[in-house]
Amino acid sequence: DPLPTESRLMNSCLQARRKCQADPTCSAAYHHLDSCTSSISTPLPSEEPSVPADCLEAAQQLRNSSLIGCMCHRRMKNQVACLDIYWTVHRARSLGNYELDVSPYEDTVTSKPWKMNLSKLNMLKPDSDLCLKFAMLCTLNDKCDRLRKAYGEACSGPHCQRHVCLRQLLTFFEKAAEPHAQGLLLCPCAPNDRGCGERRRNTIAPNCALPPVAPNCLELRRLCFSDPLCRSRLVDFQTHCHPMDILGTCATEQSRCLRAYLGLIGTAMTPNFVSNVNTSVALSCTCRGSGNLQEECEMLEGFFSHNPCLTEAIAAKMRFHSQLFSQDWPHPTFAVMAHQNEN
């Protein structure tokens, strides 16, 4: 997939920043706001921000610039630089009027067909589980295979370096074609097929990628919020996998929720399947020792483990993946729309 260029974004933060630099007032305000970072700690939802007056003034000046409302893209070049600008500007939007974080990522729906050659799968036993089949589809694709091997190497061995492993995982889920990445991770298993479930759970190399001792979930979030990329992915996830009501309806499309979920893999907030017998997912953290923030911690943890929007999005994608192999397609090579199961 070609990386999206800035020009393809409606209002890229990189472009907006360049425009701002050409305007002395905007440029000064931006620099001032940027230097406010140390004096304005990013507040967690339970905290009220304390904002110096000069920072408020700088924020006010930026409110009329094109930086307000600027966005980034998950697959763009210089993504981290774009996100840095976004979060600097975000303070201008929310200072003195703390709003819930808004996803920095612009919605783009890909309708590019995904070509798969299923005929090559006949080297597998006919009764092979679907996780094996999707792994084979990745192997048969040069790019997917190369990226998968890269994280496989980084995440294996008794002395794997977790930060290197995470970086390679992040690269895989960012650069591999979305259907390949989703097929690999969200492959369906028969209810009693523990081998298949184990393979699926091990897709992200949890022994290396996940912390050996589960940290407190709020500490994990604090760590995540200190990194623009992780913070962006978490906010994107909370935006698009938010259950709108008690029926668990997703606030946006299920496909958008899944994209946001996969975007977390390789960050500090990497989720995974809990067991090899079902498709329940969770963060690798605990709410023990949260003191008077227990309620807030449980809400964060529950957003992963007890989220009917996410559960149904995963289930729908797995049903879709099952259908790929259960239908008699007219030709061994066929095209599947990448966004076929949006609701």
Epitope: P243, D245, I246, L247, G248, N278, S280, E295, E298, M299, G302, S305, H306, N307, P308, C309, T311, A315
Partner: antibody, heavy 120, light 106 residues
Framework: EVQLVESGGGLVQPGGSLRLSCAAS????????MSWVRQVPGKGLEWVSA????????YNAESVKGRFTISRDNSKNMLYLQMNSLRAEDTAVYYC?????????????WGQGTLVTVSS | DIVMTQSPSTLSASVGDRVTITCRAS??????LAWYQQKPGKAPKLLIY???SLESGVPSRFSGSGSGTEFTLTISSLQPDDFATYYC????????FGGGTKLEIK
């Protein structure tokens, strides 16, 4: 410590009205969906009504649709159930219940209940 | 509406026994199932949620299993305090409760 205290129950004639209240404390009230669940003495539990944390969305069981209205006042940490056109089969202990997670009707805390008797 | 069928409706057992209560849903509810314990004159108490997650503060002798339409609550070694009525509840689509299982002393 989470506390839910119901009030407003009593004896009412068929066709009459009653308003139940539930005072909540010990948690961030506006962050959670709340619900009313009833139980005919000596019988099982029946979910009656629910309301989202913001109060924007309400949900009712078929048996009470058009007759019962759930509402909340987040500034006072109060939950209400307005019951109109009451029938004998509405006789039950009514419990106010807090959801464990905002997006599902799973109840981790319950009040002590208030008895509503509909009889002539 | 999803109908929850609990069995048995009454169960006689002794302290130290291992007991199992079953709950069947009329259609798949994934793992959105909870178990509650209720004692006479008291409000129900949450024991298990998401089919197998133990609620904080609940003794580990209580466990839950199952997914789809078949679920079980197991008490590994009955204690005197466990004699009560147990209800299953689905919360996959709104909420419905099973008819209850009264666990009494043999």
């Amino acid at each position: 410590e989470v506390q839910l205290v119901e009030s407003g129950g009593g004896l009412v004639q068929p066709g009459g009205s009653l308003r139940l209240s539930c005072a909540a404390s010990g948690f961030t009230f506006s962050s959670y969906a709340m619900s009313w669940v009833r139980q005919v003495p000596g019988k099982g539990l029946e979910w009656v009504s629910a309301i989202s944390g913001s109060g924007d969305n309400t949900y009712n069981a078929e048996s009470v649709k058009g007759r019962f209205t759930i509402s909340r006042d987040n500034s006072k940490n109060m939950l209400y159930l307005q019951m109109n056109s009451l029938r004998a089969e509405d006789t039950a202990v009514y419990y106010c219940a807090k959801t464990k997670f905002s997006s599902s009707l799973l109840f981790d805390y319950w009040g002590q209940g208030t008895l509503v008797t509909v009889s002539s | 509406d999803i109908v929850m069928t609990q069995s048995p409706s009454t169960l006689s057992a002794s302290v130290g026994d291992r007991v199992t209560i079953t709950c069947r849903a009329s259609q798949s509810i994934s793992w959105w199932l909870a178990w509650y314990q209720q004692k006479p004159g008291k409000a129900p108490k949450l024991l298990i949620y998401k089919a197998s997650s133990l609620e904080s503060g609940v003794p580990s002798r209580f466990s839950g299993s199952g997914s789809g339409t078949e679920f079980t609550l197991t008490i590994s070694s009955l204690q005197p305090d466990d004699f009560a009525t147990y209800y299953c509840q689905q919360y996959n689509s709104y909420s419905t409760f099973g008819g209850g299982t009264k666990l009494e002393i043999k």
